[in-house]
């Protein structure tokens, strides 16, 4: 699987999940988020050669087509597969508010 366990431990040029830390205050200007200060959002990148974690028959065919026709622009894209939520804490006035934000952390990628 093209997940963090594999991708973060290997120098993989092809489609894989890559580490990306986002600081809420410095990177996004969200000064009001109290905790966490930031988090590993991660992202997917890298080429999708034939049979590389193909998501659908279409992406398999597209990957084969691109392998056999390297000059063609059509090829599968490396995109998130599994995402996890992130819990944040902020204050409304002096009242703490905890929210779970869905699909915030990329855990694995696929070619689609």
């Amino acid at each position: 699987a093209l997940d963090t366990n594999y991708c973060f431990r290997n120098l993989e040029e092809n489609c894989c999940v890559r580490p990306l830390y986002i600081d809420f205050r410095q990177d996004l200007g969200w000064k009001w988020v109290h905790e966490p200060k930031g988090y590993y959002a991660n992202f997917c990148s890298g080429p999708c050669p034939y049979l590389r974690s193909a998501d659908t028959t279409h992406s398999t065919v597209l990957g084969l087509y691109n392998t056999l026709n390297p000059e063609a622009s059509a090829s599968p894209c490396c995109v998130p597969q599994d995402l996890e939520p992130l819990t944040i804490l902020y204050y409304v006035g002096r009242t703490p508010k905890v929210e779970q934000l869905s699909n915030m952390v990329v855990k694995s990628c696929k070619c689609s």
Epitope: L28, G29, W30, K31, W32, Y90, Y91, V92, G93, R94, T95, K97, E99, L101
Partner: antibody
Framework: EVQLVQSGAEVKKPGASVKVSCKTS????????MNWVRQAPGAGLDWMGQ????????NYNEMFEGRVTLTADTSTSTAYMELSSLRAGDIAVYYC??????????????WGQGTLVTVSS | DIVMTQTPPSLSVSPRETASISCRAS??????????MHWYLQKPGQSPQLLIY???NLESGVSDRFSGSGSGTDFTLRISRVEANDTGVYYC?????????FGQGTKLELK
């Protein structure tokens, strides 16, 4: 230049709902909280609630008894305020106003031009 | 809810004089070393505009004839050398507690 442009005046019957839009430009919509404030004729300002457009978090003033729903469309940088079960006491100018950016509840540094909602049978 | 009481309700000032508006909160609006109190002016037929942020910080583009002071529960907005363009209704606002609340307004007129 930061701009908040609201939809036009509305006339509604008692018991109906109204939905006011606030189209923004000149800043990153998903970076700031958007507040809604109402002002009855000749009266002061009442905070209705707020929304964080990036993922739709909302905080409401209990004064509005769950009649207010705030939404946002990030693709068009537009915020919406819907008020249901309208009554005569809801006749007011409704403003959208951008939060200053340091806190969730905050001062408001840019305001829309206001939308007059009239309730009449 | 925190109740904001402004005095006076209305004020008539001669040009070039100084006007003072008071705002008293029903409980302290101070937290974490800040006073969560702000001031707005609503000119006739217009939307409110932010003048003073966090009790004493002048908002960008606002004349330095406006100044704010105070802490805890008692705050003051001062307008020096009053001009015709300063007429309108002034509001204080707190955001230390949910819900955010405004004062009832002070109407400033020129003599």
């Amino acid at each position: 230049e930061v701009q908040l442009v609201q939809s036009g005046a509305e006339v509604k019957k008692p018991g109906a709902s109204v939905k006011v839009s606030c189209k923004t430009s000149g800043y990153i919509f998903m970076k700031y909280w958007m507040n809604w404030v109402r002002q009855a004729p000749g009266a002061g300002l009442d905070w209705m609630g707020q929304i964080f457009p990036a993922w739709g978090s909302t905080n409401y003033n209990e004064m509005f008894e769950g009649r207010v729903t705030l939404t946002a469309d990030t693709s068009t940088s537009t915020a919406y305020m819907e008020l249901s079960s309208l009554r005569a006491g809801d006749i007011a100018v409704y403003y959208c106003a951008r939060g200053y950016g340091n806190y969730a509840l905050d001062a408001m540094d840019y305001w829309g031009q206001g939308t007059l909602v009239t309730v009449s049978s | 809810d925190i109740v904001m009481t402004q005095t006076p309700p209305s004020l008539s000032v001669s040009p070039r004089e100084t006007a003072s508006i008071s705002c008293r909160a029903s409980e302290s609006v101070d937290s974490y070393g800040n006073s969560f109190m702000h001031w707005y002016l609503q000119k006739p037929g217009q939307s409110p505009q932010l003048l003073i942020y966090l009790a004493s910080n002048l908002e960008s583009g606002v004349s330095d004839r406006f100044s704010g002071s105070g802490s805890g529960t008692d705050f003051t907005l001062r307008i020096s050398r009053v001009e015709a363009n300063d007429t309108g209704v002034y509001y204080c606002q707190q955001n230390n507690e949910d819900p955010l609340t405004f004062g009832q307004g002070t109407k400033l007129e020129l003599k």
